[in-house]
């Protein structure tokens, strides 16, 4: 029951997390104009991964897409890639985890197969969450660097007469959404991995055998020994761990693929 709850909760948390990652990726407020030095601006600038927007004094917001691909900063391209990889992995993870849910019966699927699928989806969620957190963190670092660079040459004088305030950008709402969503996806993935440990069928190493000693009619069942020493639980853990390690090795190929994105 606890395993089903852990798996179900892991799925729901990951689902919320991936929805958040998608939302963050689509949002326009990755960076917003810092109003500290210009609180009276009637023109408010903010930027996303795909377009930049300006809210004017009329309340009208005009957005312009980044219609160039080659002209964009490499860091922005990297952030886009990380977020998309996170979404794709998360979506595949969700698809896999639906079939892995203990509460859903699909034909005569073995519990061991469900355990492997749960672990696979869990690892996918973990990598997805890490991709989102990495993407948002790279963008945040980019903002901090640019912020202090623009602060250094804040005012560009025109013949020393007129001052033009350079627009500085600070953290937008999308960054916080991305961090939280990435964290949730990561937590959901860990929960799926934990649930996987309790999903594999319990296997006894010995069949119950009756030994007939001469003159006695006592049935000796080593299964009783298993329960008292905890040997069975060790066997269970070992069994799942071995299976888990194999699945984990298979999934390890994913991060290396990201190197080429």
């Amino acid at each position: 029951m606890a395993v089903t709850a852990c798996q179900g909760l892991g799925f729901v948390v990951s689902l919320i997390g991936i929805a958040g990652i998608i939302a963050a990726t689509c949002m326009d407020q990755w960076s917003t104009q810092d109003l500290y030095n210009n609180p009276v601006t009637a023109v408010f600038n903010y930027q996303g991964l795909w377009r930049s927007c300006v809210r004017e004094s009329s309340g009208f917001t005009e957005c312009r897409g980044y219609f160039t691909l080659l002209g964009l900063p490499a860091m922005l391209q990297a952030v886009r890639a990380l977020m998309i990889v996170g979404i794709v992995l998360g979506a595949i993870g969700l698809l896999v985890s639906i079939f892995a849910l203990k509460c859903i019966r699909i034909g005569s699927m073995e519990d061991s197969a469900k355990a492997n699928m749960t672990l696979t989806s869990g690892i996918m969620f973990i990598v997805s969450g890490l991709c989102a957190i990495a993407g948002v963190s790279v963008f945040a670092n980019m903002l901090v660097t640019n912020f202090w660079m623009s602060t250094a040459n804040m005012y560009t004088g025109m013949g020393g007469m007129v001052q033009t305030v350079q627009t500085r950008y600070t953290f937008g709402a999308a960054l916080f959404v991305g961090w939280v969503a990435g964290g949730l996806t990561l937590i959901g993935g860990v929960m799926m991995c934990i649930a996987c440990r309790g999903l594999a069928p319990e296997e006894t190493n010995y069949k119950a055998v009756s030994y007939h000693a001469s003159g006695h009619s006592v049935a000796y069942k080593p299964g009783g020994f298993k329960a008292s020493t905890g040997f069975g639980s060790n066997t269970k853990n070992k069994k799942i761990y071995d299976g888990g390690a194999r699945t984990e090795d298979e999934v390890q190929s994913y991060p290396s693929k990201h190197d080429y994105v």
Epitope: V40, N45, S57, S58, G59, R64, T164, V165
Partner: antibody, heavy 115, light 113 residues
Framework: EIQLQQSGPDLMKPGSSVKISCTAS????????IHWVKQSHGKTLEWIGY????????RYNQKFEGKAALTVDKSSTTAYMHLTSLTSDDSAVYYC????????WGQGTLVTVSA | DIVMTQSPSSLTVTAGEKVTMTCKSS????????????LTWYQQKPGQPPKLLIS???TRQSGVPDRFTGSGSGTDFTLTISSVQAEDLAVYYC?????????FGAGTKLELK
């Protein structure tokens, strides 16, 4: 057709208050701020402030803070400007303006403050 | 507050003449976010509300004759009427649309000889 229809002229006593209305039609009322502008006789235009019909948020020119209060009624797509403690300096034509770059203006409301 | 200075305060012209009026702002009206200058020009005829002519320094409003041209960047802006018509006689205001409080110039009055 987009229109901003303002209330009629008002002759007010010094110290009294007046409420001018501006009813918008022909566009999405909550999508654009309603700005208010004062034009004293033979003088330039002065921006009073704006109200966001979407959430009722306001911003005022410091000069008119305490003098003008902006409100909105979404159901009737009407914006209001309440001017208090009227003096002869408040005698002017008051305009409401909206849409991008103040594309549309009301016809103006003449407020005359006289004893 | 951004101060808008218009010159000349009045202009006396003959029909068909080319007219240029200027507007200077005390601070730059250039928004680095989209590289647009938030300077607006209005025309006001007696007894009427102002009418939008040009937004963002050079974008002519639809329905405005092409004899009206806006130019300039940063702090210096110009409104040019290539060939003045009788119906152009009015007061022309420039407006800072970049920073609160939004401010208007004192206006340039266009009169016929």
């Amino acid at each position: 057709e987009i229109q901003l229809q303002q209330s009629g002229p008002d002759l007010m006593k010094p110290g009294s208050s007046v409420k001018i209305s501006c009813t918008a039609s022909g566009y999405s009322f909550t999508s654009y701020y309603i700005h208010w502008v004062k034009q004293s006789h033979g003088k330039t235009l002065e921006w009073i402030g704006y109200i966001d019909p979407f959430n009722g948020g306001t911003r005022y020119n410091q000069k008119f803070e305490g003098k003008a209060a902006l409100t909105v009624d979404k159901s009737s797509t009407t914006a209001y400007m309440h001017l208090t403690s009227l003096t002869s300096d408040d005698s002017a034509v008051y305009y409401c303006a909206s849409l991008r770059f103040f594309t549309y203006w009301g016809q103006g409301t003449l407020v005359t403050v006289s004893a | 507050d951004i101060v808008m200075t218009q010159s000349p305060s009045s202009l006396t012209v003959t029909a068909g003449e080319k007219v240029t009026m200027t507007c200077k702002s005390s601070q730059s009206l250039l928004n680095s976010g989209n590289q647009e200058n938030y300077l607006t020009w209005y025309q006001q005829k007696p007894g009427q509300p102002p009418k939008l002519l040009i937004s963002r320094a050079s974008t002519r409003q639809s329905g405005v004759p092409d004899r009206f041209t806006g130019s300039g960047s940063g702090t210096d802006f110009t409104l040019t009427i290539s060939s003045v018509q009788a119906e152009d006689l009015a007061v022309y205001y420039c407006q800072n649309d970049y920073s609160y409080p939004l401010t208007f110039g004192a206006g340039t009055k266009l009169e016929l000889k």
